[in-house]
C-alpha cells in the first residue's frame, strides 16, 4: 500500500512550498510581514489543479561511465561529462513519419538500436501493455521484419549488446538480433493463472514493485525468471462501467489474495540464451527454494546477479520475520545451479518483520565473493553490513542513531550511500562515501554544498560511478547538479529552477516548519505548512495530513507544490503532518511499535499530535480536521471514530476499513494471519466499522474509486453500510471507473475541488 503519486507529489513531477527552513526555526517567504500590505496573489486551487507553476526536472539516462542521454525540445541529446559538451543523439524529426505517439524509448547497451514504445495501455501501478518497434541507428531505419507483437507485457535489453527479452501472453521470448525471429522460452503462460517473467497482482504491488520478473546476467548469457501460479488464488471482482453506451457493465476479475487467503506459488528458473534454437525447446533450469522455505508458504523477494555465473536469491516466509539468501553458482559440468547451504544467509526479526518493506538487496563486490547489505543492527537501526559469502556473520561498516536509506554505488575503493544522519534529522537525505579500506573514513558529499536550500538528496551514478547527478528536492526549489567522483567536484548546474523562482516571487507562498515533539522521552517529528505572514499570536484552522503506515515518513525537507500549498496560501489553513509510532527511518523501536497492532498506536499518536499542536497557541482547537488517502484514509477514519473530541471533521480517500479485505503480503507482514491461533482478535477489533457510533460526533467525507484494484471499493462500501446502520449522517463521493490514484484529469480536479469545499465548510471559511 502506497500513497498515490498525486498525493505525494501533487501533479507528477511537481513539488512544494517555497522558502528555506532551518530546523526548528521558521523562515517566512520573501516579502513583507504585513499581510494587508502584500498585494501579491496567493497560490490558488486552480494553480494546483492546472499546474500553473511547473517545477523543472532534469531527467537523464546514463549510457556509459561518462555519457548520458537527456531530452531537450523533444530532441534526444547526449552529454559527455569528460569533455563537458552535448551533441544531438536523435533529432525529434527522426520519427515524424512514424505514425504513432512514442510513449518511451530505450537504447540498446551497445548503442546500435533504439526500442520505441507506443500504444501504452496501463494495467496496475507498474504494469502496462504496449507495442514496440526497433530503429536501427546505424542504418537509420525502422526494422520491419520479425517485429515484437502488439500487447507485449514487458521488454528489456540485455545488459550488453542488443539481445531482447520480452513477455507476451504470459510467456517469455528472446530475440538474439532485433531483425531475427524470437525464441520462445516458456510455453505454460495462461492469463490470470500462470505468469512467466511477469508478476501477478500481489507480487507487482507488494514484493517487486515492478511488472518485470526477468533478470539478465551481467553479460547477457543467462536469463533468470520467476513463474507465478495463481491457480488457487481467489478473484476480486468489480464492475467497470465504461462508456455510457455499454448496456451491461464489464466485470473485472483479478487474482488477489486477501489476508489469510490462498497465495500465489512461485518457481524460479535460469535459461542459457546462448544455446537457444528454433528446433528444440529451451531448457530452463529450476533453482528451488531452500528447505526452510519449502515447509510452508513463502515468497521470492529478491534476485541479484553477483557475477556472470553466480546469482543470489532471497526467499521470505509467509510469516515475514524470517528470510534466507541463497547464493547459487553455475556448474558447467552439469549445467545446473548449485546453492550451497554453507553460503546461506538467514535474516530474521524478533521485534517485527524483515526489512523496511522486504529484505534489502545485496551489493556484490566485483569478484562476487562478498557483498554489502542494509540490515537492522543490535540497536534496531538500519545500517550497512559487510558479508563474505562463506561466513555467517557480517561486519557493520556504519553505525549510529540514524539510518542508511540506500546503497547507491560500489566501486573497488568506495561505497556510496544515502542516509539521514546529518544534523540528526530523519526527514533529511544526504549522499556519503565510505572508504572500503578504512571504515572510519566517511565523507558527506552533499551536506555542505548548499545547506540551506538542499537537505534532501537523491543520486544517479554513471555506469562505473565515475560521475553522478545530485538531485536536491528541498527545502528550497529543486536543484540538479553534475559531479565527478574523482574529486567529488561539482562540474555544472544542470537545472536550478530559476525561472520558477522568479515566478514565485510574485506569489504569497506558505513556509514550512519542521520540528519535533517529545513524547515518552522519544522525539517525534512533524511538519507544518504555515500560511503566508504566519503570526503565532493568531489562531489558525489546522488540517492534519496523515498517512502513518508502517515505515512511512510525512515530515521531511522536500519542497512541494500541492493541495496543502493552496490551503495554506489561499485559505490560511495550517497543514500539518506527524510521524508517530510505526513511522520509518528512525530505528525499529519506533517502526516495530505497531507490529501485530495496526490501528492502535499510529492512530493514537495522530490524535496526540493534534492535541500537542492545539497547545501551541496558534491553532484554533475548534477547527481541527484530518485527511488521508489509502492507509491515511484508514487512520483518518479510525481517528474520527475514536471519539476523541479533538477533530471537527475529516476526509478519508480510498481507505482500508478492515484488514481482512486488504492483500495478504502487505497485511500479514504487520498483522500475521487472521486465524484464532495467530491474530484474528486484533484483525476484528481494528476495523473502522466497529467505531461507527462515534462518527455521530464528527463530519465525515468518504471517497473511493469504483475500479480500485488495490484498496477495493468494498472497503468503503462496508464503512458506508455500518454508518447507515447506526444512523450516522455523512458525506460520500464515488469516482466511477477510477482506481486507487483517482488520477484521471477530470476526477483529479473534481476530488480536490470537492475536498476543498468540504474543508472550507468545516472551517466556516467563505
Amino acid at each position: 500500500m502506497k500513497t498515490p503519486w498525486k498525493v505525494l507529489l501533487g501533479l507528477l513531477g511537481a513539488a512544494a512550498l517555497v522558502t528555506i527552513i532551518t530546523v526548528p526555526v521558521v523562515l517566512l517567504n520573501k516579502g513583507t510581514d504585513d499581510a494587508t500590505a502584500d498585494s501579491r496573489k496567493t497560490y490558488t486551487l486552480t494553480d494546483y489543479l492546472k499546474n500553473t507553476y511547473r517545477l523543472k526536472l532534469y531527467s537523464l539516462r546514463w549510457i556509459s561511465d561518462h555519457e548520458y542521454l537527456y531530452k531537450q525540445e523533444n530532441n534526444i541529446l547526449v552529454f559527455n561529462a569528460e569533455y563537458g559538451n552535448s551533441s544531438v543523439f536523435l533529432e525529434n524529426s527522426t520519427f515524424d513519419e512514424f505514425g504513432h505517439s512514442i510513449n518511451d524509448y530505450s537504447i540498446s547497451p551497445d548503442g546500435q538500436f533504439i526500442l520505441l514504445e507506443y500504444n501504452y495501455v496501463k494495467q496496475w501501478r507498474h504494469s502496462y501493455t504496449a507495442s514496440y518497434d526497433i530503429y536501427d541507428l546505424n542504418k537509420r531505419q525502422l526494422i520491419t521484419e520479425e517485429r515484437i507483437p502488439n500487447n507485449t507485457q514487458w521488454v528489456t535489453w540485455s545488459p550488453v549488446g542488443h539481445k531482447l527479452a520480452y513477455v507476451w501472453n504470459n510467456d517469455i521470448y528472446v530475440k538474439i538480433e532485433p531483425n531475427l525471429p524470437s525464441y520462445r522460452i516458456t510455453w505454460t503462460g495462461k492469463e490470470d493463472i500462470i505468469y512467466n517473467g511477469i508478476t501477478d497482482w500481489v507480487y507487482e504491488e507488494e514484493v517487486f514493485s515492478a511488472y518485470s520478473a526477468l533478470w539478465w546476467s551481467p553479460n547477457g548469457t543467462f536469463l533468470a525468471y520467476a513463474q507465478f501460479n495463481d491457480t488457487e488464488v481467489p478473484l476480486i471482482e468489480y464492475s467497470f462501467y465504461s462508456d455510457e453506451s455499454l448496456q451491461y457493465p464489464k466485470t473485472v476479475r483479478v487474482p488477489y489474495p486477501k489476508a489469510g487467503a490462498v497465495n500465489p506459488t512461485v518457481k524460479f528458473f535460469v535459461v542459457n540464451t546462448d544455446s537457444l534454437s528454433s528446433v528444440t525447446n529451451a531448457t530452463s533450469i529450476q533453482i528451488t527454494a531452500p528447505a526452510s522455505m519449502l515447509i510452508g508458504d513463502h515468497y521470492l523477494c529478491d534476485v541479484t546477479w553477483a557475477t556472470q555465473e553466480r546469482i543470489s536469491l532471497q526467499w521470505l516466509r509467509r510469516i515475514q520475520n524470517y528470510s534466507v539468501m541463497d547464493i547459487c553458482d553455475y556448474d558447467e559440468s552439469s549445467g545446473r545451479w548449485n546453492c550451497l547451504v554453507a553460503r546461506q544467509h538467514i535474516e530474521m526479526s524478533t521485534t517485527g518483520w524483515v526489512g523496511r518493506f522486504r529484505p534489502s538487496e545485496p551489493h556484490f563486490t566485483l569478484d562476487g565473493n562478498s557483498f554489502y547489505k542494509i540490515i537492522s543492527n543490535e540497536e534496531g537501526y538500519r545500517h550497512i553490513c559487510y558479508f563474505q559469502i562463506d561466513k555467517k556473520d557480517c561486519t557493520f561498516i556504519t553505525k549510529g542513531t540514524w539510518e542508511v536509506i540506500g546503497i547507491e554505488a560500489l566501486t573497488s575503493d568506495y561505497l556510496y550511500y544515502i542516509s539521514n544522519e546529518y544534523k540528526g534529522m530523519p526527514g533529511g537525505r544526504n549522499l556519503y562515501k565510505i572508504q572500503l579500506s578504512d571504515y572510519t573514513k566517511v565523507t558527506c558529499l552533499s551536506c555542505e554544498l548548499n545547506p540551506e536550500r538542499c537537505q534532501y538528496y537523491s543520486v544517479s551514478f554513471s555506469k562505473e560511478a565515475k560521475y553522478y547527478q545530485l538531485r536536491c528536492s528541498g527545502p528550497g526549489l529543486p536543484l540538479y547538479t553534475l559531479h565527478s567522483s574523482v574529486n567529488d567536484k561539482g562540474l555544472r548546474v544542470l537545472e536550478d529552477n530559476s525561472a520558477l523562482d522568479k515566478m514565485l516571487q510574485n506569489v504569497q507562498m506558505p513556509s514550512k516548519k519542521l520540528d519535533f515533539i517529545i513524547l515518552n522521552e522519544t522525539k517525534f517529528w512533524y511538519q507544518m505548512i504555515l500560511p503566508p505572514h504566519f503570526d503565532k499570536s493568531k489562531k489558525y484552522p489546522l488540517l492534519l495530513d496523515v498517512y502513518a503506515g508502517p515505515c512511512s515518513q510525512k515530515a521531511d525537507t522536500v519542497f512541494r507544490l500541492n493541495w496543502a500549498t493552496y490551503l495554506a496560501s489561499t485559505e490560511n489553513i495550517i497543514v500539518a503532518s506527524f510521524d508517530g509510532r510505526g513511522s520509518g527511518y528512525q530505528g525499529d523501536k519506533i517502526m516495530h511499535a505497531i507490529n501485530r497492532r495496526l490501528g492502535t498506536f499510529e492512530v493514537e499518536d495522530q490524535i496526540e499530535a493534534a492535541r500537542q499542536f492545539s497547545k501551541m497557541g496558534f491553532v484554533d482547537n475548534k477547527r481541527i480536521a484530518i485527511w488521508g488517502w489509502s492507509y491515511g484514509g484508514y487512520v483518518t477514519s479510525m481517528v474520527l471514530g475514536s471519539g476523541s473530541g479533538v477533530f471537527k471533521c475529516g476526509i478519508a480517500v480510498a481507505p482500508v476499513s478492515r484488514w481482512e479485505y486488504y492483500d495478504s503480503v502487505y497485511t500479514e507482514r504487520y498483522m500475521g494471519l487472521p486465524t484464532p491461533e495467530d491474530n484474528l482478535d486484533h484483525y476484528r477489533n481494528s476495523t473502522v466499522m466497529s467505531r461507527a457510533e462515534n462518527f455521530k460526533q464528527v463530519e465525515y467525507l468518504l471517497i473511493h474509486g469504483t475500479a480500485d484494484d488495490n484498496v477495493h471499493f468494498q472497503q468503503s462500501a462496508q464503512i458506508s453500510k455500518a454508518l447507515v446502520d447506526v444512523g450516522v449522517d455523512f458525506q460520500a463521493m464515488w469516482y466511477t471507473d477510477e482506481d486507487h490514484g483517482i488520477a484521471s484529469s477530470t476526477a483529479h480536479q473534481h476530488i480536490y475541488t470537492h475536498m476543498s469545499h468540504f474543508i472550507k465548510q468545516c472551517f466556516s471559511l467563505p
Epitope: 531475427l180 544455446s275 528446433v279
Partner: antibody
Framework: EVQLQQSGAELMKPGASVKISCKAT????????IEWVKQRPGHGLEWIGE????????HYNERFKGKATFTADTSSKTVYMQLSSLTSEDSAVYYC??????????WGQGTLVTVSA | DIPMTQTTSSLSASLGDRVTISCRAS??????LNWYQQKPDGTVKLLIY???RLHSGVPSRFSGSGSGTDYSLTISNLEQEDIATYFC?????????FGGGTKLEIK
C-alpha cells in the same frame, strides 16, 4: 577467438569403434551446441546430431541412432563422438561445429575416418 | 526430413561476374536457410544465416534472399578466393539437412 580442434585421421577395421575428439577454445564451452556433420565424397553433408555440453542434452538424426554417441567433458572443454560397428559406409570426413542458435557458425578442420579391412 | 535441392551441381563463371546459386526446400522453412562455403582444402565457413544475414567477417559481395521454399545466394563481384563449393542448409526442423552443393569454378 572461437576454435574447434579435432583429433587426427583414423584408419579402422570393420566392426571396430572409433572415438573422435573436438576441443573447444575461445568461448563458454557449456553455452553452445556442438554439431557433428558427416561428409562422404559424392554424398554431400549429412547432419549426425548435436550435444549441449554441461546439461548433456543430445539430439540424433534417426539414421545415426545406435551408430553415433556423443559425450562431453567440461573440464577439458572437449566433445567426443564415438562411432560403433564401423563399416565402409562410415568412411568419411567428420566435422564438429559450434552452432549459434540456428546456424553452424564455427567448423572444426575435420577428421578423416577410413574403414578398411 | 526436409530434402534440400541445389539443382546446379557445378557452375562456371568469370572473375568480376555476378553469380547466383539457388536452393529449394521440399516445404516452407520460414527463412531458416543458411549458406556455407567449403574450400578445396576442406575448410568450411558460414557465409549467410537466416536467409540474408551476413555472418561477421564475410565480405559484403555475398548476399542472400528468398522465402518459403526458394532461396538463393548471390556473389556480386566474383573474386578468385570465392572458388569453392557452396552448400545450403535448413535450420527449421530436425534433422538439419543440407543441399548437395554447388561447385563454383572459373571459366
Amino acid at each position: 577467438e572461437v576454435q574447434l580442434q579435432q583429433s587426427g585421421a583414423e584408419l579402422m577395421k570393420p566392426g571396430a569403434s572409433v572415438k573422435i575428439s573436438c576441443k573447444a577454445t575461445g568461448y563458454t564451452f557449456s553455452s553452445y551446441w556442438i554439431e557433428w556433420v558427416k561428409q562422404r565424397p559424392g554424398h554431400g553433408l549429412e547432419w549426425i546430431g548435436e550435444i549441449l555440453p554441461g546439461i548433456g542434452t543430445t539430439h540424433y538424426n534417426e539414421r545415426f541412432k545406435g551408430k553415433a554417441t556423443f559425450t562431453a567433458d567440461t573440464s577439458s572443454k572437449t566433445v567426443y563422438m564415438q562411432l560403433s560397428s564401423l563399416t565402409s559406409e562410415d568412411s568419411a570426413v567428420y566435422y564438429c561445429v559450434r552452432k549459434n542458435y540456428d546456424w553452424f557458425a564455427y567448423w572444426g578442420q575435420g577428421t578423416l575416418v577410413t574403414v578398411s579391412a | 526430413d526436409i530434402p534440400m535441392t541445389q539443382t546446379t551441381s557445378s557452375l562456371s563463371a568469370s572473375l568480376g561476374d555476378r553469380v547466383t546459386i539457388s536452393c529449394r526446400a521440399s516445404q516452407d522453412i520460414s527463412n531458416y536457410l543458411n549458406w556455407y562455403q567449403q574450400k578445396p582444402d576442406g575448410t568450411v565457413k558460414l557465409l549467410i544465416y537466416y536467409t540474408s544475414r551476413l555472418h561477421s567477417g564475410v565480405p559484403s559481395r555475398f548476399s542472400g534472399s528468398g522465402s518459403g521454399t526458394d532461396y538463393s545466394l548471390t556473389i556480386s563481384n566474383l573474386e578468385q578466393e570465392d572458388i569453392a563449393t557452396y552448400f545450403c542448409q535448413q535450420g527449421n526442423t530436425l534433422p538439419y539437412t543440407f543441399g548437395g552443393g554447388t561447385k563454383l569454378e572459373i571459366k
